[in-house]
């Protein structure tokens, strides 16, 4: 297993609709054709897996059905979007990138993006 640098923004604020987007960029040492991207969440000393996708270079990322993640790839950049977030989902979201094929296997883990989620205030009752 060889190490690889992964960069991601330090902080992102989710939209009022609970959507957060950030770029995960990796320094590919070679010409990988199969890449796996996993998003991890660290909160309260627990690390959980948010979503994962394997893609072939040049193709779209495909996440599992009912995943809260979507994404696109462009070269060594992955544009990730996480939907349906609520205030309780605030935490450090870590991008993990694995170059699966061809060998050798490379692994890179970013420092994490702190995503802040603020639940929207309920709309006041209106007579209109």
């Amino acid at each position: 297993c060889k190490a690889m640098h992964v960069a991601q923004p330090a902080v992102v604020l989710a939209s009022s609709r609970g959507i957060a987007s950030f770029v995960c960029e990796y320094a590919s040492p070679g010409k990988a054709t199969e890449v796996r991207v996993t998003v991890l969440r660290q909160a309260d000393s627990q690390v959980t897996e948010v979503c994962a996708a394997t893609y072939m270079m040049g193709n779209e990322l495909t996440f599992l059905d009912d995943s809260i993640c979507t994404g696109t790839s462009s070269g060594n950049q992955v544009n990730l979007t996480i939907q349906g977030l609520r205030a309780m989902d605030t935490g450090l979201y870590i991008c993990k990138v694995e170059l699966m094929y061809p060998p050798p296997y490379y692994l890179g883990i970013g420092n994490g993006t702190q995503i802040y989620v603020i639940d929207p205030e309920p709309c006041p009752d209106s007579d209109f």
Epitope: R36, T38, L40, R41, D44, Q46, V47, T48, E49, V50, C51, A52, T54, L64, D66, S67, I68, G84, M88, D89
Partner: antibody, heavy 123, light 106 residues
Framework: QVQLQESGPGLVKPSQTLSLTCTVS????????VYWVRQPPGKGLEWLGV???????NYNSALMSRLTISKDTSKNQVSLKLSSVTAADTAVYYC?????????????????WGQGTLVTVSS | DIQMTQSPSSLSASVGDRVTITCSAT?????MSWYQQKPGKAPKLLIY???NLASGVPSRFSGSGSGTDYTLTISSLQPEDFATYYC?????????FGGGTKVEIK
């Protein structure tokens, strides 16, 4: 159809390592998580840990220092290793299929379970 | 960790009775599952995502709730429903189960 089956020794000596294998069929380990749950005789259910579709693991904090879960996707197998066992680890151990990730739009359930295997810790 | 308190721990009921089992969490949770377990058998999923009926489960079972309080209801108890029922939260890890409710024949 979806099936999970636990296997491993039924008797483990104190201080040794308990090793179990969950062999699955009817679904892919890259599309679902596999969750481990145990039940001491006559007692309730205790969640032990999970290995998600992406291969990341999460453990019950009470067992974290002793527990390891791994998988071999090509063999459709998930393994559980619990070290330094005592009589308190005597239980029926179940593996179950569950959500592929911790955060989903829907589908929060362990929908298929293995039949369970009784592990007794005794000298 | 989120603790799940299930009540009652046991109950006696007759065929045809309406049975309600409650589960209370120590903090607000997002989703609840309910399982049925018979002696010597693995748990069986009844309800997922708080209120959705699992495949093949009779419609007499229903789930509801939000926040910290959740309920499993059996509208008309049948002979095959005598078992132990467990709630389980999906809001945070570690996942936790309620202590179980044993439904016995009166």
């Amino acid at each position: 159809q979806v099936q999970l089956q636990e296997s491993g020794p039924g008797l483990v000596k104190p201080s040794q390592t308990l090793s179990l294998t969950c062999t699955v069929s009817g679904f892919s380990l890259t599309s679902y998580g596999v969750y481990w749950v145990r039940q001491p005789p006559g007692k309730g259910l205790e969640w032990l840990g999970v290995i998600w579709a992406g291969g990341t693991t999460n453990y019950n904090s009470a067992l974290m220092s002793r527990l390891t879960i791994s998988k071999d996707t090509s063999k459709n197998q998930v393994s559980l290793k619990l070290s330094s066992v005592t009589a308190a680890d005597t239980a029926v151990y179940y593996c179950a299929r569950g959500p592929p990730h911790a955060m989903m739009k829907r589908g929060y359930a362990m929908d298929y379970w293995g039949q369970g295997t009784l592990v007794t810790v005794s000298s | 960790d989120i603790q799940m308190t299930q009540s009652p721990s046991s109950l006696s009921a007759s065929v045809g009775d309406r049975v309600t089992i409650t589960c209370s969490a120590t903090s607000s949770i997002t989703y609840m599952s309910w399982y049925q377990q018979k002696p010597g058998k693995a748990p069986k999923l009844l309800i997922y995502d708080t209120s959705n009926l699992a495949s093949g489960v009779p419609s007499r079972f229903s789930g509801s709730g939000s926040g910290t309080d959740y309920t499993l209801t059996i509208s008309s108890l049948q002979p095959e429903d005598f078992a132990t029922y467990y709630c389980q939260q999906w809001s945070s890890y570690p996942l936790t189960f309620g202590g179980g409710t044993k439904v016995e024949i009166k």
